[in-house]
Interface confidence: low
Amino acid sequence: PALPEDGGSGAFPPGHFKDPKRLYCKNGGFFLRIHPDGRVDGVREKSDPHIKLQLQAEERGVVSIKGVCANRYLAMKEDGRLLASKCVTDECFFFERLESNNYNTYRSRKYTSWYVALKRTGQYKLGSKTGPGQKAILFLPMSAKS
């Protein structure tokens, strides 16, 4: 299996992309997937091209998440939906935090109590239904070079 590597995705200055990543969700073992039509979900197949993501550090502790194939940016909408937009907006920035179990969480900078999350079915979880301590919000950045 692909192994995680240097996971702190924002370890370079703003504007500098690191190697592409996959975001592996603890809840069900899904990889976060961004479709070309803007849909967001999870898939277990690590060869799916739409799970290759670029995490860009915008400022200390804040990242944007771009689907490489989709050429779209993950966004948290005002109603809690996750989708991917063609352009970067203020809904496309997330606080990346290392939790006590060494998984990462991605919390919306605009809607500050809502997290990126995947259900056990592989569907995204509404931000309004997420919160600290949930398995659905825990992600591991893994190398997508292979």
Epitope: P4, G7, E58, R60, S100
Partner: nanobody
């Protein structure tokens, strides 16, 4: 470049004990494990599971354990040796997995947008069988 090397895996009978070590090299100023480290495992056909962590996130020197290993496994570190340990007692067949250590370290501040980075070892196999 930071390198992590695990050791201590092997075959053990149910109820037995093993101690895994994770030695770090290539660190600057011995800072690698002062920020914390953890152990993950991956059983055949399963996903990665966080087993234990120490000193990660905002928790200082606190420890974390998965429910399945609480009371049996103990994570510790020796900063002077830049080594992370996992003491595993009362081992069960379901503990069979490849165990990976991770270490958290601080990049040079002028390069850091997010200061904490993570390095992974290559894994050591633990087999619990009679």
């Amino acid at each position: 470049q930071v390198q992590l090397v695990e050791s201590g895996g092997g075959l053990v009978q149910p109820g037995g004990s093993l101690r895994l070590s994770c030695a770090a090299s290539g660190t600057e100023d011995g800072r690698l494990l002062t920020l914390g480290g953890s152990w993950f495992r991956q059983a055949p056909g399963q996903g990665l599971e966080a087993v234990a962590a120490i000193g990660a996130g905002d928790r200082g020197g606190a420890t974390y354990y998965a429910d399945s290993v609480k009371g049996r496994f103990t994570i510790s570190r020796d900063n002077s040796k830049n080594t992370l340990y996992l003491q595993m007692n009362s081992l069960r067949a379901e503990d069979t997995a490849v165990y990976y250590c991770t270490a958290l370290y601080e990049r040079q501040p002028q390069l850091a947008a997010t200061k904490v980075a993570r390095k992974w070892g290559q894994g050591t196999l633990v087999t619990v069988s009679s």
